[in-house]
Interface confidence: low
């Protein structure tokens, strides 16, 4: 007996009721929301003489579908309508003429949960493989982006920070990256699964948060990672250590206190207090000009805001409650179609601007 015919006998759960129509597919697959999965699938059907030259059409249906009434979720038949909610996301990736019924799901959504069965049609030979069926489980997105900071962050020196989602799949809708940082930044190039932020830190940016937020618009799900910036000011011999962080990737960080202009802890504390006071006054003054407040998790641009092409300063929004002197969180808003941007921020020179402002850079 040829191997082809032995396979369905060896595979557990591979046989449908009909010994000459069999299908092998894993009975359950789990995919995180917004991500993708490729489910390998093989099927076999007898080929009568008169159907040998007929094209083979494959279809994936939701469990309970009525073939004559309901559209499939995926098919290789070009003129066949598919379910609207799965269009472009479910794809019969395998070639049915080669006994391949592999199913690709991208931008997985919660409502994709459920069971699916495969059907083949070749001329007058038509068969729905009701067993085994494929059960799809869509779970919470637990993956988080990784932020890579190469080398040491030094005041006034630009560094490229990379936020990557290497776990995302190539076939899915490219995610939207948003950066939120207090430090002066501009947006560097991006790839399908990574975004570069060019940061030119100041001494006062040490210890502030930097967040990379990634939104998978195809599924409407968002994930983010926040790290603390470690700015090392080293006029002479720098020493670096590894920041423990949260396992988000390598980050070279400061080893000790900021050296240089300030001589002692008392002076440092006094200056910090003054800076805080000055900042509070500036913040109160600027609050009057603010019209809207946007939380840092909001990745959608506010309507009516200036394009980065026309703004010299990042737009200041109302303050968010904070226990530190980090201040308000203005949002730099970008055109939807803008993939790469170079943004000009004020306060690039730490000696001229001691206040802290947050800027959010968004790219699609």
């Amino acid at each position: 007996m040829p191997l082809l015919l032995l396979l369905p006998l060896l595979w557990a759960g591979a046989l449908a009721m009909d010994p000459n129509f069999w299908l092998q597919v894993q009975e359950s697959v789990t995919v995180q929301e917004g991500l993708c999965v490729l489910v390998p699938c093989t099927f076999f059907h007898p080929i009568p003489y008169y159907d040998k030259n007929s094209p083979v059409h494959g279809y994936w249906f939701r469990e309970g579908a009525i073939i004559s009434r309901d559209s499939p979720v995926a098919t290789n038949k070009l003129d066949q309508e598919v379910q609207e909610e799965t269009q472009g996301r479910f794809r019969l990736l395998g070639d049915p003429s080669r006994n391949n019924c592999s199913l690709s799901i991208v931008d997985a959504r919660r409502r994709d949960n459920g069971s699916y069965f495969f059907r083949m049609e070749r001329g007058s030979t038509k068969y729905s493989y009701k067993s085994p069926q494929l059960s799809v489980h869509v779970t919470d997105l637990t993956h988080r982006p990784k932020i890579l900071i190469p080398g040491t962050l030094e005041p006034g020196h630009s560094k490229n920070l990379t936020c990557s989602v290497s776990w995302a799949c190539e076939q899915g809708t490219p995610p939207i990256f948003s950066w939120l940082s207090a430090a002066p930044t501009s947006l560097g190039p991006r790839t399908t699964h990574s975004s570069v932020l060019i940061i030119t830190p100041r001494p006062q940016d040490h210890g502030t948060n930097l967040t990379c937020q990634v939104k998978f618009a195809g599924a409407g799900v968002t994930t983010e990672r926040t790290i603390q910036l470690n700015v090392t000011y080293v006029p002479q011999n720098p020493t670096t250590g590894i920041f423990p962080g949260d396992g988000s990737g390598k980050q070279e960080t400061r080893a000790g206190v900021v050296h240089g202009a300030i001589g002692g802890a008392g002076v440092t504390a006094l200056l910090a207090l003054c800076l805080c006071l000055i900042f509070f006054i500036v913040k109160t003054h600027r609050r009057k000009a603010a019209r809207t407040a946007v939380g840092r998790n909001d990745t959608h641009p506010t309507t009516g805001s200036a394009s980065p092409k026309h703004q010299k300063k990042s737009k200041l929004h109302g303050p968010t409650e904070t226990s530190s002197c980090s201040g308000a969180a203005p949002t730099v808003e970008m055109d939807e179609e803008l993939h790469y941007a170079s943004l000009n921020f004020h306060g690039m020179n730490p000696s001229k601007d001691t206040s802290t402002e947050y800027s959010e850079v968004r790219t699609q």
Partner: antibody
């Protein structure tokens, strides 16, 4: 007791049509593959058509393709064969046959090869 | 058209062992597809004897056995009896015809 009883046979002119039926009893019809096999006078057996248990798959021998249509009504435990454009060569005893399981042909695996006694169809002018 | 060939007739004496053969091709018997043997007594409908190459159908005496080597299938009847006189057909799924019967062998018990 398993019974397959064919009916609807008779004399028909060339080019004419005929529908034969097969009433099943004594077994769970909806679980069985069913088919039609014919035997011309003094000749051997010729498989002509088959249908799987759910009715999704229908297959035909080259000699009857596009002229004959097999169907089944599981609620009525009945198998049908609609024959159009009949030719003298179609003259034969038509047997209804069934096999347990949704098999491709009537006797796979379990060996419960159920056969009716046949109905004679004569195509002649 | 796929062809499964059988000798048109054979004969044997009571008590003898006879072997009826059925020759197919890689698209049917040789392809590893299920093979069956049928017995058709004069004036009656066919009856399943052997299914899946060598499994006897219920009620079939163990004098009947089946085997297969490559594209050649065999039905062996040991201790031939007068009531074994009948037409014997092999049947197999075929890639080109879906199901095909051999031409049939008429066995005469002398």
């Amino acid at each position: 007791q398993v019974q397959l009883v064919e009916s609807g046979g008779g004399l028909v002119q060339p080019g004419g049509s005929l529908r034969v039926s097969c009433a099943a009893s004594g077994f769970t019809f909806k679980n069985y593959y069913m088919g039609w096999v014919r035997q011309a006078p003094g000749k051997g057996l010729e498989w002509i058509s088959g249908i799987n248990s759910g009715g999704e798959v229908t297959t035909y021998a080259d000699s009857v393709k596009d002229r004959f249509t097999i169907s089944r009504d599981n609620a009525k435990n009945t198998l049908y064969l609609q024959m159009n454009s009949l030719k003298p060569d179609d003259t034969a005893l038509y047997y209804c046959a069934g096999g347990e399981g949704s098999s491709w042909y009537p006797d796979y695996y379990y060996g419960n090869g159920y056969w009716g006694e046949g109905t004679l169809i004569t195509v002649s002018s | 058209q796929a062809v499964v060939t059988q000798l048109s007739s054979m004969s044997g004496s009571p008590g003898q062992t006879v072997t009826i053969t059925c020759t197919g091709s890689s698209s049917n018997i040789g392809g590893g597809y299920y093979l069956s043997w049928y017995q058709q007594l004069p004036g009656t409908a066919p009856k399943l004897l052997i299914y899946n190459v060598n499994n006897r159908a219920s009620g079939v005496p163990n004098r009947f056995s089946g085997s297969k080597t490559g594209s050649l299938a065999s039905l062996t009847i040991t201790g031939l009896q007068a009531e074994d006189e009948a037409d014997y057909y092999c049947g197999s799924y075929d890639e080109s015809l879906s199901y095909v019967f051999g031409g049939g062998t008429h066995l005469t018990v002398l």
